[in-house]
Interface confidence: low
């Protein structure tokens, strides 16, 4: 039995009568074949279905697709296929929806062989009506929406062509050829790289990279040599190849190219790879994979600047087979982030940081767990994570941890207790303070979801069998109940519930099959009558985020401020309902040297809080001081940590040293690198 | 245009060293890397090892690993290869080749690989008592 | 180290027809896979890369297809200048490895 079923559970009343009751199903017309689900805008109810099948014939496959939309959530379809005048939606294009609640949706329909270009299906009122376009080129990638402007949308041609249009779809324009990779920026920027010789992959480290702010009337190019490039934030990244051998290295922009500045960052070879795990408007963590085929490589992360690297997490787990990371911000709580690192013995490990990256521990040995087979001390383990990595690898485990803004504290994931990540069928563990404690939820492998900010929590067993049980909680997984939605068991493909956790529905997507026929079929369920009222002030309860010890003051500063939250008592069965807003009200702390990093130049001893000036300069520190701007080279060591709000307290203010003295060298200084305009 | 020129054929006797040049021109000769690659007679191709010639770092095929050396003078573009404690089965065609590669390490699955492009003309290297 | 396996190892062909080589790697080599044609007493010259990509200055009647472990050099209209021995060669894990060869001749 699931942890958590005793005596003490505060079970919900009548259940089966109240699901019953809102449990819809919906049997699709179909041959099984594949099928993608999208939610349009937000909050609208407005679900799209595009099913997908391949009929063989003797010469050649015949595909035929079904478009279906629901307006409430999915208990209900409409088959609006003749709106797509009954055409082949090419699926690996998917839908292209819109950003925010535009209500504007792309399907992208596969043509025959002869054709001039691609045709494309566009509505602008959430599916209600579509209008065909035929295409002047034939589309190699999905539109891409500016996040400005929906009716701006940008694809790339089979023939590297760059193409805008500047009315929701309705006309084309080609403003550019031989292009690579193609990205909008903000302010409606397009970012792109070109080829001069022959191919992307030809010329890949011999890339320019381009920038129009007037969707295509002009152009600038911003920077050459380019191997690839990347947005995070407010930052716009390049690798570019150095001059002397097949190298490269990170520059970083904060003005959208116009000028850049060298990342103080190791460069990397031929086959090594920088990957952005993730960024924000203040830092950003990145990868820098190791030399060799290890499969792992080091974290650093930013100052404000995007320029100067602190190392954050050795022998971080970057696979470079399948390019699978298991780095994962925990969104339910800020500052938190889980990875993996590969450790001497090739075992995987988990680890956490609750500071943006500047400390990372092991995760804590949930109380109710006992150490398994991989610890060598039974009484001493850790928590240990599954996550994309574990996926790839095809353990048992059918999905990554679950987190969401508005659960505050929340993270539910599937791992293992011991010294390492172990092969074993792992159970499902949950976090209710952002990872700082965790309890077994679930025997067993299984699909969750979060609904209601977190005043439900719903999960299916992962089985190879059929199934017609869900089970769910309304206590952050302390008690579960199990309810069955069908008395025919369907074989289950996935759990849909609208993005956000703010739903109280949740569709349970499978199919049937029988000795003749094989066919769709959805379930959803609306727990509105299982939270009966609406939650009042009574039911919410003050917690103290980032806090062990309430009574220090400085416990649960993290970046310079404490969070105190307002968040649901367990207890209690209400509806935060729809218009949720997480409350949380900040404090400031007084500034430690915690909350500075050391500046280029400078580097903390072992257990010192100190920045220590180097006593010399080498590998990439010295290419940073012969390349690097001057303004970059002047210090007094010490640098605010990105997005820390501390005020008062230490103020490690002391001379400031011009480093330029100490590049020294018996390299050339290169010329600075020049963007042109055309 | 790109060319790679070897020194001409050797006769040596057993226990003795051989030192092949590989002088480049027509490119940079710091973008790329260059391999060494022997033929036996009447035999497969079979790769030795590679240069970066910006640093001089080397990577060796095991087999090879004590008995070669492969430096480089960035003066004159050349590449040399030095094998030692020579055997009657080293009695091969030995050839530079510029290989835009990295050192021999594996990358992400989205590493590209440009092939050994240009190739000298090769250098026959006789070992015979 | 990588094993590439070339079959077959002799393959007869009259002018003017198709012929298709294989390649096979003990693991997989992803797209870092080269092929290269050599004539008696010439140095190998290179006319494929990453798997698929030709050579500059290399007929089209060349092509090179496969990922992971297999691959294939189809040459689509054999013609006279074509005879000789082919090639395949890994550079996804040091030391690059060339498979045996295949030689190919006039039926």
């Known amino acids: 039995s699931a942890p958590g079923e005793d005596e003490e559970c505060g079970r919900v009343r009548d259940f089966v009568a109240k699901l019953a009751n809102n449990t819809h199903q919906h049997v699709f017309d179909d041959l099984r074949g594949s099928v993608s689900l999208s939610w349009v805008g937000d909050s609208t109810g407005v679900i799209l279905v595009l099913t997908t099948f391949h009929v063989p014939l003797v010469i050649m496959t015949f595909g035929q697709s079904k478009l279906y939309r629901s307006e409430d959530y999915g208990k209900n379809f409409k088959d609006i296929t003749d709106l797509i005048n009954n055409t082949f939606i090419r699926t690996e294009f998917g839908m292209a929806i819109g950003p925010e609640n535009s209500g504007k949706v792309v399907l992208t329909a596969e043509v025959s062989g002869g054709s001039r270009g691609g045709r494309i299906f566009r509505s602008s009122d959430f599916a209600k009506n579509f209008v065909q376009t035929d295409l002047p080129f034939h589309p190699l990638t999905q539109m891409m929406y500016s996040p400005q402007n929906s009716d701006y949308l940008l694809a790339l041609s089979t023939e590297n062509g760059l193409w805008v249009s500047k009315n929701f779809g309705g006309k084309w324009e080609e403003i550019h050829k031989a292009v690579c990779l193609a990205k909008w920026g903000s302010d409606n920027t397009i970012f792109f790289t070109t080829y001069a010789n022959g191919s992307c992959k030809a010329d890949l480290g011999a890339l320019e990279l381009w920038r129009t702010s007037d969707l295509g009337k002009s152009f600038k190019t911003i920077g050459v040599k380019i191997y690839s490039f990347g947005l995070g934030g407010r930052f716009l990244f390049a690798s570019v190849m150095a001059d002397k051998d097949t190298t490269r290295r990170i520059h970083v922009s904060t003005d959208q190219g116009d000028t850049w500045s060298m990342a103080q960052l190791p460069s990397v070879g031929q086959e090594q790879f920088y990957s952005i795990l993730a960024a924000n408007d203040d830092m950003v963590f990145m990868h820098v994979d190791e030399p060799g085929d290890t499969g792992f490589g080091t974290i650093f992360t930013s100052d404000d600047r995007g320029i100067v690297y602190s190392k954050s997490l050795d022998r971080h787990l970057y696979t470079t087979t399948g390019g699978e990371t298991d780095f994962t911000n925990v969104t339910s709580l800020r500052g938190v982030y889980i990875t993996s690192v590969l450790s001497e013995d090739n075992s995987i490990q988990t680890m956490i940081t609750f500071d943006q990256g500047g400390r990372w521990t092991h995760l804590r040995k949930p109380e109710n767990s006992e150490c398994d087979a991989t610890a060598k001390n039974k009484n001493e383990c850790s928590l240990h994570i599954h996550a994309s990595y574990s996926i790839s690898q095809k353990l048992n485990v059918p999905m990554a941890p679950l987190s969401e803004p508005n659960a505050v504290g929340i993270v539910i994931a599937h791992g293992s207790v011991g010294d390492a990540i172990s092969v074993m069928v792992p159970d499902v563990y949950i976090s209710d303070d952002g990872g700082y404690s965790w309890t077994k939820m679930l025997e067993g492998p299984h699909y969750y979801t979060i609904l209601d900010s977190g005043g439900i929590i719903v999960a299916i067993e992962h089985s190879s069998r059929p199934i017609n049980v869900i089970k769910f909680s309304t206590d952050e997984g302390q008690c579960w109940q199990t309810y069955t939605f069908t008395r025919d068991p369907i074989y289950f493909t996935g759990l849909a519930s609208e993005p956000g956790a703010r739903s109280m529905n949740i569709s349970i997507w499978g199919f049937t099959e029988s000795f003749l026929t094989s066919q769709w079929v959805s379930y959803t369920i609306d727990f509105k009558d299982i939270l009966e009222r609406n939650c009042e002030e009574k039911d919410y309860t003050i917690w103290a985020a980032h806090s062990t010890d309430p009574e220090d003051y400085e416990d649960g500063c993290i970046l310079g401020y404490k969070e105190q939250f307002l968040r649901l008592r367990k207890s209690s069965v209400c509806q935060n309902g729809r218009d949720y807003v997480v409350t949380k009200q900040p404090s400031i702390c007084l500034c430690s040297l915690e909350d500075f990093l050391c500046d280029f130049g400078y580097y903390r001893p072992e257990n010192d809080s100190k920045c220590v000036e180097q006593p010399e300069l080498k590998g990439h520190d010295l290419e940073f001081c012969l390349y690097g701007r001057e303004e970059h080279l002047t210090t007094n060591g010490y640098r605010k940590i990105p997005g820390d709000k501390c005020q008062g307290g230490v103020n490690p203010v002391r001379e400031v040293k011009d480093l330029k003295k100490k590049c020294t060298s018996n390299f050339l200084s290169p010329e600075k690198q020049n963007s042109k305009s055309n | 245009q790109v060319q790679l020129v070897q020194s001409g054929a050797e006769v040596k006797k057993p226990g003795a060293s051989v030192k092949v040049s590989c002088k480049a021109s027509?490119?940079?000769?710091?973008?790329?890397?260059m391999s060494w690659v022997r033929q036996a007679p009447g035999q497969g191709l079979e790769w030795m090892g590679i240069i970066n010639p910006v640093g001089g770092s080397t990577s060796y095929a095991q087999k090879f690993q004590g008995r070669v050396t492969m430096t480089r003078d960035t003066s004159t573009s050349t590449v040399y290869m030095e094998l030692s404690s020579l055997r009657s089965e080293d009695t091969a065609v030995y050839y530079c080749?510029?290989?835009?590669?990295?050192?021999?390490?594996?990358?992400?699955?989205?590493?590209?690989?440009?092939?050994?492009?240009?190739w000298g003309q090769g250098t026959t290297v006789t070992v015979s008592s | 180290e990588i094993v590439m396996t070339q079959s077959p190892a002799t393959l007869s062909v009259s002018p003017g027809e198709r012929a298709t080589l294989s390649c096979r790697a003990s693991?997989?080599?992803?797209?870092?896979l080269a092929w290269y044609q050599q004539k008696p007493g010439q140095a190998p010259r290179l006319l494929i890369y990453g798997a698929s990509t030709r050579a500059t200055g290399i007929p089209a009647r060349f092509s090179g297809s496969g990922s992971g472990t297999e691959f294939t050099l189809t040459i689509s209209s054999l013609q006279s200048e074509d005879f000789a021995v082919y090639y395949c060669?890994?550079?996804?894990?040091?030391?690059?490895?060339f498979g045996g060869g295949t030689k190919v001749e006039i039926k």
């Open positions: 027509g490119y940079t000769f710091t973008s790329r890397y």
């Open positions: 080749a510029r290989d835009p590669s990295g050192i021999a390490a594996a990358g992400p699955a989205s590493r590209y690989y440009y092939g050994m492009d240009v």
């Open positions: 060669q890994q550079a996804r894990l040091g030391p690059w490895t």
């Open positions: 693991q997989s080599v992803s797209s870092n």
